[in-house]
């Protein structure tokens, strides 16, 4: 059974992941972003279901494509290099989903834009955090 300290740790990690995802969204979904139109042409796979931490496997599998899109951005738009930002997210995701269980991600039929993709995972984080508090 999860202890109060492990729950608190999970909550803090989810809050960190949430802030990272929101920061990326803020850098992209902005009228001052010269590459917004181009970035919106890239398609991302969305999870069929995302209600548990194990479903973060679906996010992990899309981190490489996410990094590739972020590489289009001007360096002044990101004070962290996309590679470092995605690396930070990857570390949190691996800790949250755990590596001991293998989960096959199921994707929805419809693909999504980067904005829809980020909003979906932001909502996921907020939802899990609300169940922990």
């Amino acid at each position: 059974a999860p202890t109060s300290s492990s729950t608190k740790k999970t909550q803090l990690q989810l809050e960190h992941l949430l802030l990272d995802l929101q920061m990326i969204l803020n850098g992209i979904n902005n009228y001052k972003n010269p590459k917004l139109t181009r970035m919106l042409t890239f398609k991302f796979y969305m999870p069929k279901k995302a209600t548990e931490l194990k479903h973060l496997q679906c996010l992990e599998e899309e981190l490489k494509p996410l990094e590739e899109v972020l590489n289009l951005a001007q360096s002044k738009n990101f004070h962290l290099r996309p590679r470092d930002l995605i690396s930070n997210i990857n570390v949190i995701v691996l800790e949250l989903k755990g590596s001991e269980t293998t989960f096959m991600c199921e994707y929805a039929d419809e693909t999504a834009t980067i904005v829809e993709f980020l909003n979906r995972w932001i909502t996921f984080c907020q939802s899990i955090i609300s169940t922990l508090t």
Partner: antibody
């Protein structure tokens, strides 16, 4: 001095069109992004549209997308808002505002506004 | 869209006394460039909006130092240290971290 002056407002029937203008003076117009923001009677501020300094990018609020078109003529130092298929809910004072995307000030200069009334 | 929520919606104050307005965003306003694009605007009766504060706490040119902004992330505050008659009007918070959105406005009036 730095100035933005809107014009073109008036009373118009639902479904009709109107074109607003915003004349800029006292600054290098072609270096600034330009916004339209509106305010319905007795209500708060609502962002409508933005155009880049060179006209290369344009974005709209969902409420006006497909009906309004923002444009600019840098040779005339003028910003425009073409409003088609007008609805009663478009009734508002329309302000233009400038923004230097590199300065981080945000919308630092606003016009006095022009009133649009959509009524049958 | 990022939703901006202001409190209170109305603030009756005594001349010379302080006033404080809060603004909360539905998500973090920290941009990937490290900046937080949160502004405060003043709209006097019958006038267009006027920029007071940009990037949380930076006073725009010509703005009296009785106006100050603070906050971080999702919670922000505008303070008027000593309210003067000319401060009467509606104050709006506004974010431009994503596409611009405004708070509902807070009406500052003299008691």
């Amino acid at each position: 001095q730095v100035q933005l002056v809107e014009s073109g407002g008036g009373v118009v029937q639902p479904g009709r069109s109107l074109r607003l203008s915003c004349a800029a003076s006292g600054f290098t117009f072609s270096s600034y992004g330009m916004h339209w923001v509106r305010q319905a009677p007795g209500k708060g501020l609502e962002w409508v549209a933005v155009i880049w300094y060179d006209g290369s990018n344009k974005y709209y609020a969902d409420s006006v997308k497909g009906r309004f078109t923002i444009s600019r003529d840098n040779s005339k130092n003028t910003l425009y808002l073409q409003m088609n298929s007008l609805r009663a809910e478009d009734t508002a004072v329309y302000y233009c505002a400038r923004e230097d995307f590199d300065s981080h000030y945000g919308m630092d200069v606003w016009g006095q506004g022009t009133t649009v009334t959509v009524s049958s | 869209d990022i939703v901006m929520t202001q409190t209170p919606l109305s603030s009756p104050v005594t001349l010379g006394q302080p006033a404080s307005i809060s603004c909360r965003s539905s998500q973090s306003l920290v941009h990937s460039d490290g900046n937080t694009y949160l502004s405060w605007l003043q709209q006097r009766p019958g006038q267009p909006p006027r920029l007071l504060i940009y990037k949380i706490s930076n006073r725009f040119s010509g703005v009296p130092d009785r106006f100050s902004g603070s906050g971080a992330g999702t919670d922000f505050t505008l303070k008027i240290s000593r309210v003067e008659a000319e401060d009467v009007g509606v104050y709006y918070c506004m974010q431009t971290t994503q596409f611009p959105t405004f708070g509902q406005g807070t009406k500052v009036e003299i008691k």
